[in-house]
Amino acid sequence: LTCLGGFASPGPVPPSTALRELIEELVNITQNQKAPLCNGSMVWSINLTAGMYCAALESLINVSGCSAIEKTQRMLSGFCPHKVSAGQFSSLHVRDTKIEVAQFVKDLLLHLKKLFREGQFN
């Protein structure tokens, strides 16, 4: 079960539903972006491979005081089996490359849409 209870969903949901809702939240962010997202904050780029949900959370969790991505952070924590805290990094980070949060969100969205279309929900 994908348990996002207490984070964004009303309780445990199927993996496909959780991924669908995460995609929609990222679409929301990209559609509603007016000023630079999170004041143009930079985050570590990640490899969009297995374990990317934790890697994405590890990267985004270092952005503080940005309400626009708080829901995304909570949703990502539902996909990541371990607790993630600021300053924590995995081997999935491309540690020599930082990108703007807006670009990070766009890249993540494109990849998640591809996974969704291909039926890769877990």
Epitope: P14, R20, E21, E24, V27, G119
Partner: antibody, heavy 118, light 107 residues
Framework: EVQLQESGPGLVKPSETLSLTCTVS????????WNWIRQPPGKGLEYMGY???????YYNPSLKSQITISRDTSKNQLSLKLSSVTAADTAVYYC????????????WGQGTTVTVSS | DIQMTQSPSSLSASVGDRVTITCHAS??????LSWYQQKPGKAPKLLIY???DLHTGVPSRFSGSGSGTDFTLTISSLQPEDFATYYC?????????FGGGTKVEIK
């Protein structure tokens, strides 16, 4: 109470494009997910795809080259276009709502019958 | 795609009978299964979701059970308005898929 009403031509010629509209009343298409499901005569139900509250779409891969789902928020309508139709596309077409964070269809339109024939 | 197989495809029963319909998924779908009732010329109506949760307004004579790959819809005491076709649907993964249906007819 949310209600759905499908409309469109009952007869479409082979190789042409089938176009249907679903009008949503009592709720906004800018929330939840709006789906198309079809049922060939005497057969079971086939899931076709959705358009989300953001306008994001998903299509069943079996129909991907044929199908387009779009919306008109000013009219609170969604539409289905199915290109290059054949007799196999003859069916009752339903629109149905799927609420956020759910995976089941809680509200359905009454359906509209489309026959593909020359 | 996940294949959903219902059995039987049709059955005859009398008012007051206990009726059981089964649905088998081609892979594990946990409890992400719903049941619908469809009457001739009408749209399907949601009866049960999450394998056993009754949708609002559905009579308590309907119940669902199962998890993983095997599921059951039970009507404890068949009423005249229950003669219809019943479909299961999986919500584990897209594209969502339905069973072939079980037609409950009057004996």
């Amino acid at each position: 109470e949310v209600q759905l009403q499908e409309s469109g031509p009952g007869l479409v010629k082979p190789s042409e494009t089938l176009s249907l509209t679903c009008t949503v009343s009592g709720g906004s298409i800018s929330s939840d997910y709006w789906n198309w499901i079809r049922q060939p005569p005497g057969k079971g139900l086939e899931y076709m795809g959705y358009i989300s509250y953001n306008g994001n779409t998903y299509y069943n891969p079996s129909l991907k080259s044929q199908i387009t789902i779009s919306r008109d928020t000013s009219k609170n309508q969604l539409s289905l276009k199915l290109s290059s139709v054949t007799a196999a596309d003859t069916a009752v077409y339903y629109c149905a709502r799927l609420a956020k964070w759910t995976w089941y269809f809680d509200i359905w339109g009454q359906g509209t019958t489309v026959t593909v024939s020359s | 795609d996940i294949q959903m197989t219902q059995s039987p495809s049709s059955l005859s029963a009398s008012v007051g009978d206990r009726v059981t319909i089964t649905c088998h998924a081609s892979q594990n779908i946990n409890v992400w299964l719903s049941w619908y009732q469809q009457k001739p010329g009408k749209a399907p109506k949601l009866l049960i979701y999450k394998a056993s949760d009754l949708h609002t307004g559905v009579p308590s004579r309907f119940s669902g059970s199962g998890s993983g790959t095997d599921f059951t819809l039970t009507i404890s005491s068949l009423q005249p308005e229950d003669f219809a076709t019943y479909y299961c649907q999986q919500g584990q993964s897209y594209p969502y898929t339905f069973g072939g249906g079980t037609k409950v007819e009057i004996k």
